[in-house]
Interface confidence: low
């Protein structure tokens, strides 16, 4: 029988900058029942506080509701593990809510094949931001990424959509059924999970010549350009 091993706070996430949750991994239990407590203080303060809510985030978590969440303030927190033989402490973790936002997936993904008579056909994709994100406040810039692939294909084709909530794609295989998903991230923060998927059947007459595969911004009303590998690499993951 030993004191507990050192715990580790391994993740903190916020869906919208208004609340956040942190999770820790217990160390070894020392063969005895172990109690965990998370304490924190805000940078510039000396007063220590205990975690306000150990329930909402599930096991080994601390949830900070609206009244406990301050933007632009760094939280300094640690976890204390205690059993009958003694205690151990995690390393201190510094958390700024601005940088831990992981939004919910975008909503209302809709995909349509558009075949205007006077223009080349294209796939039109649109979606809405996640409900919990209030873009009107100006606190958020959400960036979007689309992935699509033929149903049977292994590799995803990925497009970075910037701040747009709609997107047009021209170069697709006629007659194929495509799977489309979208995700989002704040300018500082983490990518959301991918949205629920939508399938779309590309008609067999969805054709274009090689010249048409070059998409100019002017051609599509400034809404889209195909991005380079360099752009894709730069935007791809936090």
């Amino acid at each position: 029988q030993l004191p507990p091993g050192k715990p580790e706070i391994f993740k903190c996430r916020s869906p919208n900058k208004e609340t956040f949750t942190c999770w820790w991994r217990p160390g070894t239990d020392g063969g005895l029942p172990t109690n965990y407590s998370l304490t924190y203080h805000r940078e510039g303060e000396t007063l220590m506080h205990e975690c306000p809510d150990y329930i909402t985030g599930g096991p080994n978590s601390c949830h900070f509701g609206k009244q406990y969440t301050s933007m632009w303030r760094t939280y300094i927190m640690m976890v204390n593990a205690t059993n009958q033989m003694g205690s151990s402490f995690s390393d201190e973790l510094y958390v700024d809510v601005t940088y831990i936002v992981q939004p919910d997936p975008p909503l209302e993904l809709a995909v349509e094949v558009k075949q205007p008579e006077d223009r080349k056909p294209y796939l039109w994709i649109k979606w809405s931001p996640p409900t919990l994100i209030d873009l009107k406040t100006g606190w958020f810039t959400l960036l979007y990424e689309i992935r699509l692939k033929p149903e049977k294909a292994a590799e995803w084709e990925i497009h970075f959509a910037g701040q747009q909530t709609e997107f047009k794609i021209l170069s697709l295989h006629p007659g194929q059924k495509y799977l489309v998903q979208v995700r989002c991230k704040p300018d500082h923060g983490y990518w959301s999970a991918w949205s629920p998927a939508t399938f779309i059947q590309i008609p067999s007459d969805f054709t274009m010549n090689d010249e048409q595969k070059l998409i100019s911004e002017e051609d599509l009303g400034g809404e889209q350009k195909l991005i380079s590998e360099e752009d894709l690499h730069h935007h791809h993951h936090h």
Partner: antibody, heavy 122, light 107 residues
Framework: QVTLKESGPVLVKPTQTLSLTCTVS??????????VSWIRQPPGKALEWLAH???????SYSTSLKSRLTISKDTSKRQVVLTMTNMDPVDTATYYC??????????????WGQGTLVTVSS | DIQMTQSPSSLSASVGDRVTITCRAS??????LNWYQQKPGKAPKLLLY???SLQSGVPSRFSGSGSGTDFTLTISSLQPEDFASYYC?????????FGQGTKVEIK
């Protein structure tokens, strides 16, 4: 409270076009993440999803019926309309509209209308 | 499109029995699986969403589990009002599809 009510003809002749209206209350068709689905159920058979429309006007249709279906909404009238062309006796069914609820990681039909039985017969 | 296969198509059980209904998707649907109950002449009623989340007002004897392709609806102790048809429905990808239904009858 949330309610949905289907209305439309109870009898349609083969080859005619069916137009069904779903009138909603207790929520707005412009609320983010809200939508309305149409589902039908032939007598004694299983449920079949037909189409849905979201607050951002995103639409989706059943693969097998896509060429015959059109869904639209009038937010101010709180109505969603489904039209189905070239009706056939096999389209005889109870037609339901239901509210789509979009949760953090979930999409589900949480409120349903009572349904309207449409019979296709000459 | 994703196919949803429910089994059994019907079952007979007694009040107090534990009842299990399974639903299999033709491809992975994560946890985007909903369960509905329907009584004769009535509209379906949502029981569970996202595979295991109980809809508000639904008795706790109903539970759901599974992710990926295989899902289960369990009624821990069947009550007289539970005799009905049950449908699974995927909302992972459009077009959405329902299972063919399971009718729970009195033995």
């Amino acid at each position: 409270q949330v309610t949905l009510k289907e209305s439309g003809p109870v009898l349609v002749k083969p080859t005619q076009t069916l137009s069904l209206t779903c009138t909603v209350s207790g929520f707005s068709l412009s609320d983010a993440g809200m939508g309305v689905s149409w589902i039908r159920q032939p007598p004694g058979k299983a449920l079949e999803w037909l189409a849905h429309i979201f607050s951002n006007d995103g639409k989706s249709y059943s693969t097998s019926l896509k060429s015959r279906l059109t869904i639209s909404k009038d937010t101010s009238k709180r109505q969603v309309v489904l039209t189905m062309t070239n009706m056939d006796p096999v389209d005889t069914a109870t037609y339901y509209c239901a509210r789509i609820r979009t949760g953090t990681y979930s999409l589900y039909l949480d409120y349903w209308g009572q349904g309207t039985l449409v019979t296709v017969s000459s | 499109d994703i196919q949803m296969t429910q089994s059994p198509s019907s079952l007979s059980a007694s009040v107090g029995d534990r009842v299990t209904i399974t639903c299999r998707a033709s491809q992975s649907i994560n946890s985007y699986l909903n369960w509905y109950q329907q009584k004769p002449g009535k509209a379906p009623k949502l029981l569970l969403y996202f595979a295991s989340s109980l809809q508000s007002g639904v008795p706790s004897r109903f539970s759901g589990s599974g992710s990926g392709t295989d899902f289960t609806l369990t009624i821990s102790s069947l009550q007289p009002e539970d005799f009905a048809s049950y449908y699974c429905q995927e909302s992972y990808s459009t077009p959405w599809t329902f299972g063919q239904g399971t009718k729970v009858e009195i033995k």
